[in-house]
């Protein structure tokens, strides 16, 4: 039967999405116990029937990976969790509407920072996602977000930074002092969706200038 308050058994049912990996998470309520079991269903906007997620029925963990089931970028999804306590009490709660394009957050990019004598080169590697194209190959963030660009910053000293940005993958900061340490930060930006990744940071030192030795 339904508990007096569903929050006694189940709270904070939500999608946590990063780079289009969509994980449903929830918390147990104050009356939840380690032997409370959880069953997960999902559906798309306007559909009548909820679909039971295989592998996430009567589980005791508090997360369920719905990446495959929520892989259509233009679709809106819901998920819901039903908690059943050892005593037979049950509670069901659902997520808000979930759009991976809108709600996914961006992880820091994968970057290689290369030291040279008077410059530092930064090479951004394409970020794969679990989203698959019609022919089955995995899409990168750049494939999905056509206005994606990279913002790079090099901290020269406490008061001076150098900035670069663009859609290309290779960048180089020139005119640097040899044998000096710099802090680089690289972020992914997607203006259309107001997205900004956490920064990738690299602390790099330019090479010593051997020409005078």
């Amino acid at each position: 039967h339904a508990p007096e308050d569903p929050s006694d058994l189940l709270q904070h049912v939500k999608f946590q999405s990063s780079n289009f990996e969509n994980i449903l998470t929830w918390d147990s309520g104050p009356e939840g116990t380690p032997d409370t079991v959880y069953s997960i269903e999902y559906k798309t906007y306007g559909e009548r029937d909820w679909v039971a997620k295989k592998g996430c029925q009567r589980i005791t963990r508090k997360s369920c990976n719905l990446t495959v089931e929520t892989g259509n970028l233009t679709e809106l999804y819901y998920a819901r969790v039903t908690a059943v306590s050892a005593g037979g009490r049950s509670a069901t709660k659902m997520t808000d509407r979930f759009s991976s394009l809108q709600h996914t957050t961006l992880k820091p990019p994968d970057v290689t920072c290369i030291s040279k004598v008077r410059s530092i080169q930064m090479i951004v590697h394409p970020t794969p996602t679990p989203i698959r194209a019609g022919d089955g190959h995995r899409l990168t963030l750049e494939d999905i977000f056509h206005d994606l660009f990279y913002h790079l910053e090099l901290q020269v000293n406490r008061t001076y930074q150098m900035h670069l940005g663009g859609k290309q993958r290779e960048y180089e900061f020139f005119g640097l002092t040899p044998d000096t340490e710099f802090l680089g930060t690289i972020m992914i930006c997607v203006p259309t969706w107001a997205k900004e990744s956490a920064p990738y940071m690299c602390r790099v030192k330019t090479l010593p200038d051997r020409t005078w030795t």
Partner: antibody, heavy 116, light 113 residues
Framework: EVQLVESGGGLVQPGGSLRLSCAAS????????MNWVRQAPGKGLEWIGE????????TYNQKFKGRATLSVDQSKNTAYLQMNSLRAEDTAVYYC?????????WGQGTLVTVSS | DIVMTQSPDSLAVSLGERATINCKSS????????????LAWYQQKPGQPPKLLIY???SRESGVPDRFSGSGSGTDFTLTISSLQAEDVAVYYC?????????FGQGTKVEIK
């Protein structure tokens, strides 16, 4: 069997407020979205807004934003519509209706009359 | 807001005859994710709440007689009652759920001729 039962209607003075209730039975309120729709006498249907009873997230018809407030009490399996600054043209039957896009179950409605 | 316009406002049809109600939206209701149309039809009898008949423009709600059918795409939709019965006397409404705010047509009253 799913049932929605509204209550709280009646005669209200212009400028007054009302709080309508929608008691759900036959399912857990938190398992589906809930909407409110109204119908003026002899007129068509007008969507007021929706609430996700699990999270409290609401979306309102701009026409009612600021005057309508949707809420739920999960422990009572009941949804609420609060309407403020009522005027004569708010006289209508107010319905709660379940689901997230179209509406599969409706309450019987409760009549609100705004008059001095 | 998407404006929904129904025609006619009322129609009288003989028992056993076909009744056709049209609904036009001010913009396309085609939902790109599933290539379906975000349109529903309701029947409302006097003193009762509306009853869902059709969703996704052509999917019949469980328990609705098969004389009711929905068709159309984009901006133009039709509800057809293939053989009008006495219990079908009611007002019929279309509703779009493509975007907020959800909006309804003004209604079409169906009577027996």
């Amino acid at each position: 069997e799913v049932q929605l039962v509204e209550s709280g209607g009646g005669l209200v003075q212009p400028g007054g407020s009302l709080r309508l209730s929608c008691a759900a039975s036959g399912y857990s309120l938190t398992a589906e979205y809930m909407n409110w729709v109204r119908q003026a006498p002899g007129k068509g249907l007008e969507w007021i807004g929706e609430i996700n009873p699990s999270t409290g997230t609401t979306t309102y018809n701009q026409k009612f934003k600021g005057r309508a407030t949707l809420s739920v009490d999960q422990s009572k399996n009941t949804a609420y519509l609060q309407m403020n600054s009522l005027r004569a043209e708010d006289t209508a039957v107010y319905y709660c209706a379940r689901f997230d896009a179209y509406f599969d179950y409706w309450g019987q409605g409760t009549l609100v009359t705004v008059s001095s | 807001d998407i404006v929904m316009t129904q025609s006619p406002d009322s129609l009288a049809v003989s028992l056993g005859e076909r009744a056709t109600i049209n609904c036009k939206s001010s913009q396309s209701l085609l939902y790109s994710s599933n290539q379906k149309n975000t349109l529903a039809w309701y029947q409302q009898k006097p003193g009762q709440p509306p009853k869902l008949l059709i969703y996704w423009a052509s999917s019949r709600e469980s328990g609705v007689p098969d004389r009711f059918s929905g068709s159309g795409s984009g901006t133009d939709f039709t509800l057809t009652i293939s053989s009008l019965q006495a219990e079908d006397v009611a007002v019929y409404y279309c509703q779009q759920y493509f975007s907020y705010p959800f909006t309804f047509g003004q209604g079409t009253k169906v009577e027996i001729k």
